[in-house]
Interface confidence: low
């Protein structure tokens, strides 16, 4: 079978399975919520738009105020537990092998030269990344492990030729603010690649990432907060220089709020993130003083 056909077949099978899985999850959540007399969760947000292009060169790039970022999607329903909810084991394990094989097929073929030469390649790469990130939250640990390896392999193989697309797909997953494992998989990989974002894309990325980081800081899962705390220094080292004072304050306030958390992990990660935001801002000393004053105010 031609490489492209194999790829499309694997895409379709995996996509339809993941959609079934999501529907099952939603149904179970709805049942649980109805038992608790709660309204069902809102539908997932629509797929995010493409990142805005850098402003045309005739317009000032740095000092000018930027248009406000798009409003965040509606907040998710009650947070999903870190471990997936119990699902009928038999029904899922029957297709576990298929899902592993589909991931491997996509992985093998998306890096093949024949597919890379296809005019549809950018679109195919987008779908592949989306599916690997979806599978990072699969109920089966084997599928999760393979999806994780596939993400690493594809990023490594296509970094030189398709870095902007890879960065965009990871950003889209962060913006989605979905399942904890998928979010973490995207967050730490985006952070690793942040220093490779083209200089003129740094400001647009920053503007779009700020509401995402603020939203992620409100997630209750400790594992998400651990990943976020590891990602923030790398993201800010690349983009902090492009943030204005107000944007830095908004981000700092989000982490300061977490210092009141009952979880020691969330308090610790928030403190680390706040310090690295100050460290990588344009006015380091000013923000250290500002943060110190706010913290002293919390003690009074």
């Amino acid at each position: 079978m031609a490489t492209l056909e194999k790829l499309m077949k694997a895409f379709e099978s995996l996509k339809s399975f993941q959609q079934q899985q999501q529907q099952q999850q939603q149904q179970q959540q709805q049942q649980q919520q109805q038992q608790q007399q709660q309204p069902p969760p809102p539908p997932p947000p629509p797929p995010p738009p493409q990142l805005p292009q850098p402003p045309p060169q005739a317009q000032p790039l740095l000092p000018q105020p930027q248009p406000p970022p798009p409003p965040p999607p509606p907040p998710p329903g009650p947070a999903v537990a870190e471990e997936p909810l119990h699902r009928p084991k038999k029904e899922l394990s029957a297709t576990k092998k298929d899902r592993v094989n589909h991931c491997l097929t996509i992985c093998e073929n998306i890096v093949a030269q024949s597919v890379r030469n296809s005019p549809e390649f950018q679109k195919l790469l987008g779908i592949a990344m989306e599916l690997f990130l979806l599978c990072s939250d699969d109920a089966e640990s084997d599928v999760r492990m393979v999806a994780d390896e596939c993400l690493n392999k594809v990023i490594k193989a296509l970094m030189d030729s398709n870095l902007p697309r890879l960065q965009l797909e990871l950003y889209k997953e962060i913006k989605k603010n979905g399942a904890p494992r998928s979010l973490r998989a995207a967050l730490w990989r985006f952070a690793e690649l942040a220093h490779l974002v083209r200089p003129q894309k740094c400001r647009p990325y920053l503007v779009n990432l700020l509401p995402c980081l603020t939203r992620t800081s409100k997630r209750p899962e400790e594992s998400v907060q651990e990943t976020l705390a590891a990602a923030v220094p790398k993201i800010m080292a690349s983009f902090g220089n492009f943030a204005n004072d107000n944007e830095i304050k908004v981000l700092l306030k989000a982490f300061i709020a977490n210092l009141k958390s009952s979880s020691p992990t969330i308090r610790r990660t928030a403190a680390g993130s706040a310090v690295s935001i100050c460290q990588h801002s344009r006015r380091t000393q000013y923000f250290y003083s500002w943060l110190l004053n706010v913290l002293l105010g919390l003690l009074v």
Epitope: Q57, A58, Q59, P60, L61, L62, P63, D160, S161, L163, P164, H195, L196, V197, R198, P199, Q200, K201, C202, S238, N241, R282
Partner: antibody, heavy 121, light 110 residues
Framework: EVQLVQSGAVMKKPGDSVRVSCRAS????????FTWVRQVPGQGLEWMGW????????NYVDSFQGRLTLTTDTSASTAYMELRSLRSDDTAIYYC??????????????WGQGTLVTVSS | QTVVTQEPTFSVSPGGTVTLTCALR?????????PSWFQQTPGQAPRTLIY???TRSSGVPARFSGSILGNKAALTIAGAQANDEADYYC??????????FGGGTKLTVL
């Protein structure tokens, strides 16, 4: 439009350091970024590194990492390039180029006249 | 280091149009690499013609234009003149803002 004036030609011995200056005639020095480029006589251009006068952020090409230091002095409206542990193959014309980062964060718009650095024992 | 390639030599007749290109040895050039073009005549400092793919530097005549052609960056000189005879260099900005120059093209106006 900004003009860049570089320091004069110098002779150095292997192992020495050289410091080349690049003075910018502008009232808004801190909005500029400076790129340093060198050209071995008869050869092509080689990108060395970049510095923002706004915040001192720098970017160095790996091959110069550890030997090259770029700095700016806002009060003197001057950018500096220091290259240490000179070798004979560092003999080249060193250019500074500037761009107003209000419009374009990285890049080269205006060039200095160049400074010939000769390294010979 | 990623290698940026240019045609070593090129010739054009006076009044003719010439397109010089700038390619990555591996991969395609897109506007995300913010290609810039420079002209250098013997004994002179380089002069910026184009930056960020197609933005002309101040004082550069409109007959110089930049674009992306297929998988390469391109500099087109329309209505070539004798004083266009020079070396032309492109630079591409890699990740994190490191610039890499092409080897240059020696343009002859015959």
């Amino acid at each position: 439009e900004v003009q860049l004036v570089q320091s004069g030609a110098v002779m150095k011995k292997p192992g020495d350091s050289v410091r080349v200056s690049c003075r910018a005639s502008t009232y808004s020095f801190s909005t500029y970024s400076f790129t340093w480029v060198r050209q071995v006589p008869g050869q092509g251009l080689e990108w060395m590194g970049w510095i923002s006068a706004y915040n001192g952020h720098t970017n160095y090409v790996d091959s110069f990492q550890g030997r090259l230091t770029l700095t700016t002095d806002t009060s003197a409206s001057t950018a500096y390039m220091e290259l240490r542990s000179l070798r004979s193959d560092d003999t080249a014309i060193y250019y500074c180029a500037a761009v107003d980062t209000t419009y374009y964060y990285y890049g080269m718009d205006v060039w200095g006249q160049g400074t010939l650095v000769t390294v010979s024992s | 280091q990623t290698v940026v390639t240019q045609e070593p030599t090129f010739s054009v007749s006076p009044g003719g149009t010439v397109t010089l290109t700038c390619a990555l040895r591996f991969g395609s050039v897109s506007s995300s690499y913010y290609p810039s073009w420079f002209q250098q005549t013997p004994g002179q400092a380089p002069r910026t013609l184009i930056y960020s793919t197609n933005t002309r530097s101040s004082g550069v005549p409109a007959r110089f234009s930049g674009s992306i052609l297929g998988n390469k960056a391109a500099l087109t000189i329309a209505g070539a003149q004798a004083n266009d005879e020079a070396d032309y260099y492109c630079v591409l900005y890699m990740g994190s803002g490191i610039g890499v120059f092409g080897g240059g093209t020696k343009l002859t106006v015959l």
